[in-house]
Interface confidence: low
């Protein structure tokens, strides 16, 4: 595992210790996309191909997999869900100053929020944007999911699973064209049932960095490159959600 400093993580940014992000990385778990145990969906016994025909289970065949909101069909199950309304956005990334002046944070009002919760990201996401989610894991929790969404696509699915075959694991993935990609799995698991948590997601030019309780957890390389189109964060799972907000650092 590499040792990262915050300065390394944000080198060239002119801000070696941006507000709100963990000041020390410690020993970083192996990065997304190349660590041992990363696997294709369907690698476990009994799993069916994603996007399969009626009656087949999605990858990671456990209840609600992966990250479907209540009432939503399992991902990829035929037919796919309709896309949201609206005209397609113009190309090009919004500038940090234009789209997200560093005067935030913006986001949900204080107080308990109803889960699943959607946090609008009106200009998409941009490098140096920090999303902070505060809440408490419910007792006997099964799952948490953060879904950075582009219309029907999920650019970044962050999915702590408390009991997948009696193991705790964090699964990250992307859904494009009604279709889940290759899972990236992380065995470091900082969540505890019944305990409060803070999740921070820092958008970098090439990846998302995720820290939990002020400790770096993982990074996930951008598979959806048009960051300005990632216009919503869905928060779901077995949590009591206190706040969800973002700011520029």
């Amino acid at each position: 595992a590499d040792n990262f400093s915050l300065h390394d993580a944000l080198s060239g940014s002119g801000n070696p210790n941006p507000q709100g992000w963990p000041g020390a990385w410690g020993n970083q778990p192996a990065g997304a996309g190349g660590y041992p145990g990363a696997s294709y969906p369907g690698a476990y016994p009994g799993q069916a191909p994603p996007g399969a025909y009626p009656g087949q289970a999605p990858p990671g065949a456990y209840p609600g997999a992966p990250g479907a909101y209540p009432g939503a069909p399992a991902p990829g199950v035929y037919p796919g869900p309709p896309s949201g309304p609206g005209a397609y956005p113009s190309s090009g990334q919004p500038s940090a100053t234009g789209a997200y002046p560093a005067t935030g944070p913006y986001g949900a009002p204080a107080g308990p929020l109803i889960v699943p919760y959607n946090l609008p990201l009106p200009g998409g996401v941009v490098p140096r944007m920090l999303i902070t989610i505060l809440g408490t894991v419910k007792p006997n929790a099964n799952r948490i999911a953060l879904d950075f969404q582009r219309g029907n696509d999920v650019a970044f699915h962050f999915n702590p699973r408390f009991n997948e075959n009696n193991r705790r694991v964090i699964v990250c993935n992307t859904k494009l064209d009604n279709n889940w990609g290759r899972e990236e799995r992380q065995s470091v698991f900082p969540f505890e049932s019944g305990k409060p948590f803070k999740i921070q997601v820092l958008v970098e030019p090439d990846h998302f960095k995720v820290a939990v309780n002020d400790a770096h957890l993982l990074q996930y390389n951008h598979r959806v490159k048009k960051l300005n189109e990632i216009s919503k964060l869905g928060i779901s799972g077995d949590i009591d959600l206190t706040s969800a907000s973002y700011t520029m650092i």
Partner: antibody, heavy 117, light 110 residues
């Protein structure tokens, strides 16, 4: 039966315009992302453009940007490709294709566009 | 010029197995995106044979299999039959929401 039927292909002069249509049936059209793919005579497949179910996201291959426009009318179960400033190298069979399952799972039979003076 | 590289042609005898490769980059085949394979007989529309790297749609013979390693995807056809003679194309999604195709491989049954 799931079906896609293209129409509108014809002989057109360089610099001219043409509008291709694709009629979809047998599935819930609005639930699916759709594509246009073309194949020049004796050549390989070439992806042109895709459009999401709600028309919110639209993408083009670099070689048609600014000349071709993809659109859809979900009420009519129809997909369209407006082609302007046509060139000889645009001569091809144009396929209407449905996206699903990590691949393009339903193809029309294609419509021939010939650009020649 | 195609973004994904396939051999122009391969050949095999009935009953044999052949493999067609599809070389890409970390921006497409190797970038956690999904590779699909299509079969096209002369004068016909392409048909999806493999999706999501290695899965077969309903109705496709289990003689067709797909795999992916790094930036290269492969289509293997076992127990070659005369009707397998066709052109085969690989395709991948990219991070820019476009799709890319290989140049195609002509399979000849000797």
């Amino acid at each position: 039966e799931v079906q896609l039927v293209e129409s509108g292909g014809s002989l057109v002069k360089p610099g001219g315009s043409l509008r291709l249509s694709c009629a979809a049936s047998g599935f819930t059209f609005s639930n699916y992302n759709m594509n246009w793919v073309r194949q020049a005579p004796g050549k390989g497949l070439e992806w042109i453009s895709s459009i999401y179910g709600s028309s919110r996201y639209i993408y083009y291959a670099d070689f048609v940007k600014g000349r071709f426009t993809i659109s859809r009318d979900n009420a009519k179960n129809s997909l369209y490709l407006q082609m302007n400033s046509l060139r000889a190298e645009d001569t091809a069979v144009y396929y209407c294709v449905r996206s699903s399952y990590g691949g393009m799972d339903v193809w029309g039979r294609g419509t021939l566009v010939t650009v020649s003076s | 010029q195609s973004v994904l590289t396939q051999p122009a042609s391969v050949s095999g005898s009935p009953g044999q197995s052949i493999t067609i490769s599809c070389a890409g980059t970390s921006s497409d085949v190797g970038g956690s995106y999904n590779v699909a394979w299509y079969q096209q007989h002369p004068g016909k529309a392409p048909k999806l044979m493999i999706y999501y790297d290695s899965y077969r749609p309903s109705g496709v013979s289990n003689r067709f299999s797909g795999s992916k390693s790094g930036n290269t995807a492969s289509l293997t056809i076992s127990g070659l039959q005369a009707e397998d003679e066709a052109d085969y194309y690989c395709s991948s999604y990219t991070g820019y929401s476009t799709r890319v195709f290989g140049g195609g491989t002509k399979l000849e049954i000797k």
